[in-house]
């Protein structure tokens, strides 16, 4: 978790002098509770936006927006703590809006936005906006949270971001798999424009079951430049096991930008349809 271009952070708006600060996610009001605290944020909204760094890289960011409730507690609002928790790693990053002037009611509802938390593809985050000072123990909560799931690199808009392109999102191998005679599979896919090796991982399963009955790995050496964007054809020999008929073929590239952590593509061959076996006709008729 990180912030995008930390130097450009602003939270001031007409009628409010405000500064954005790094936060330890442990505001002072936790340790020294105040008697009077503001109410919670209203209408927390999170959207996926895309922002360029000064170097020209494109990153997905969480666009966080919320409004204030129209009550008197606005007079005791000193700022807000924005927290983003990445759920699979428990990593948390916070920033603090520090109000340098008192808020006053005006003709329209106060609205705040922040779009500098960089998020990763296919990750889930808990986004929380806490009004400051935080409530006294057993006081009414004055925060709002939402769990936000970021699309993966298959998503059309995510595909062109820097983290996705670095993991090989622009490569479309267009995998085809066909079953040949004599327990063989022909795998065909389009090579990318990089002289790097590939690995084909074959996993076979029985019909309607999820434990594998055969696994095989096939190494494909790095193509020469004249082979870039050409089709690569590989024939894999299967184990002759009756019922081991559903095959998953996964292609793992080793691009220089992502090494052994590149996006993998896969294709599946289903078991052949079994023809309905007709009821056997008895060769004698019972007499009763």
């Amino acid at each position: 978790l990180r912030l995008l271009d930390h130097r450009a952070l602003v939270c001031s708006q007409p009628g409010l002098n405000c500064t954005v600060k790094n936060s330890t996610c442990l505001d002072d009001s936790w340790i020294h509770p105040r008697n009077l605290t503001p109410s919670s944020p209203k209408d927390l909204q999170i959207q996926l936006h895309f922002a360029h760094t000064q170097q020209g890289d494109l990153f997905p960011v969480a666009h966080i927006e919320w409004t204030l409730q129209t009550d008197a507690s606005i007079l005791y609002l000193e700022g807000a703590e924005l927290s983003v928790l990445q759920l699979n790693t428990n990593e948390r990053l916070c920033v603090r809006f520090e109000f340098l002037s008192k808020l006053r009611h005006h003709h329209r509802r106060w609205r705040f936005t922040f779009s500098h938390f960089v998020v990763d593809p296919d990750q889930e985050y808990e986004v929380t906006v806490h009004h400051l000072p935080k409530p006294i123990p057993d006081g009414d909560p004055n925060h709002q949270s939402k769990n936000f799931l970021v699309p993966d690199c298959e998503h059309a808009r995510m595909k062109v971001t820097t983290p996705c392109m670095s993991s090989g999102s622009l490569w479309d191998p267009n995998i085809t798999v066909e079953t040949l005679e004599a327990h063989q599979l022909r795998v065909s896919f389009t090579l990318w424009n990089e002289s790097t090796h590939y690995q084909i991982l074959l996993t076979s399963f029985p019909h309607m079951e999820n434990h594998s009955c055969f696994e095989h790995m096939h190494h494909i050496p790095a193509p020469r430049p004249e082979e870039f964007h050409q089709r690569s054809n590989v024939t894999l020999t299967l184990r002759n096991l009756k019922g081991c008929c559903r095959h998953q073929v996964q292609i793992q590239p080793f691009f220089s930008s992502c090494l052994n952590d590149c996006l993998r593509h896969s294709a599946t061959v289903s078991c052949p349809e079994m023809p309905d076996t007709p009821e056997p006709i008895p060769d004698y008729m019972p007499l009763w």
Epitope: Q45, I46, Q47, L48, H63, E65, K146, N147, F148, L149, V150, P151, D152, E154, H155, A156, R157
Partner: nanobody
Framework: QVQLVESGGGLVQPGRSLRLSCAAS????????MHWVRQAPGKGLEWVSG????????DYADSVKGRFTISRDNAKNSLYLQMNSLRPEDTALYYC???????????????????WGQGTLVTVSS
């Protein structure tokens, strides 16, 4: 322009099933999370279920968990709601709604729903 058209509603007996469909047009369907929202007679709006852009993540209101299944077919620009074990309290006007922003939030919309269908009426009665 964006259009969401629901179908599949009707009168059904308690315990029976119904499948709602929503045909979408006028936007890149597979960019956005989609949702079902309902409004019972004389009541407010209630979020029912949501599904992420590729169908990989689904979420349901507690009142329908285990009975309703949301799905989508991006090739057909369509959203579905399979409703099983229907109860009289499921009687409502069911709306298909598009999330305004990219991404997906559990328990409802990340931002606002910016487009809604006209609704399809589901009546559960014996």
């Amino acid at each position: 322009q964006v259009q969401l058209v629901e179908s599949g509603g009707g009168l059904v007996q308690p315990g029976r099933s119904l499948r709602l469909s929503c045909a979408a047009s006028g936007f890149t369907f597979d960019d956005y999370a989609m949702h079902w929202v309902r409004q019972a007679p004389g009541k407010g709006l209630e979020w029912v279920s949501g599904i992420s852009w590729n169908g990989g993540t689904k979420d349901y209101a507690d009142s329908v968990k285990g009975r309703f299944t949301i799905s989508r077919d991006n090739a057909k620009n369509s959203l579905y709601l399979q409703m099983n074990s229907l109860r009289p309290e499921d009687t409502a006007l069911y709306y298909c709604a598009k999330d305004q922003g990219l991404g997906f939030c559990r328990g409802g919309s990340c931002s606002h729903f910016d487009y809604w269908g006209q609704g399809t009426l589901v009546t559960v009665s014996s």
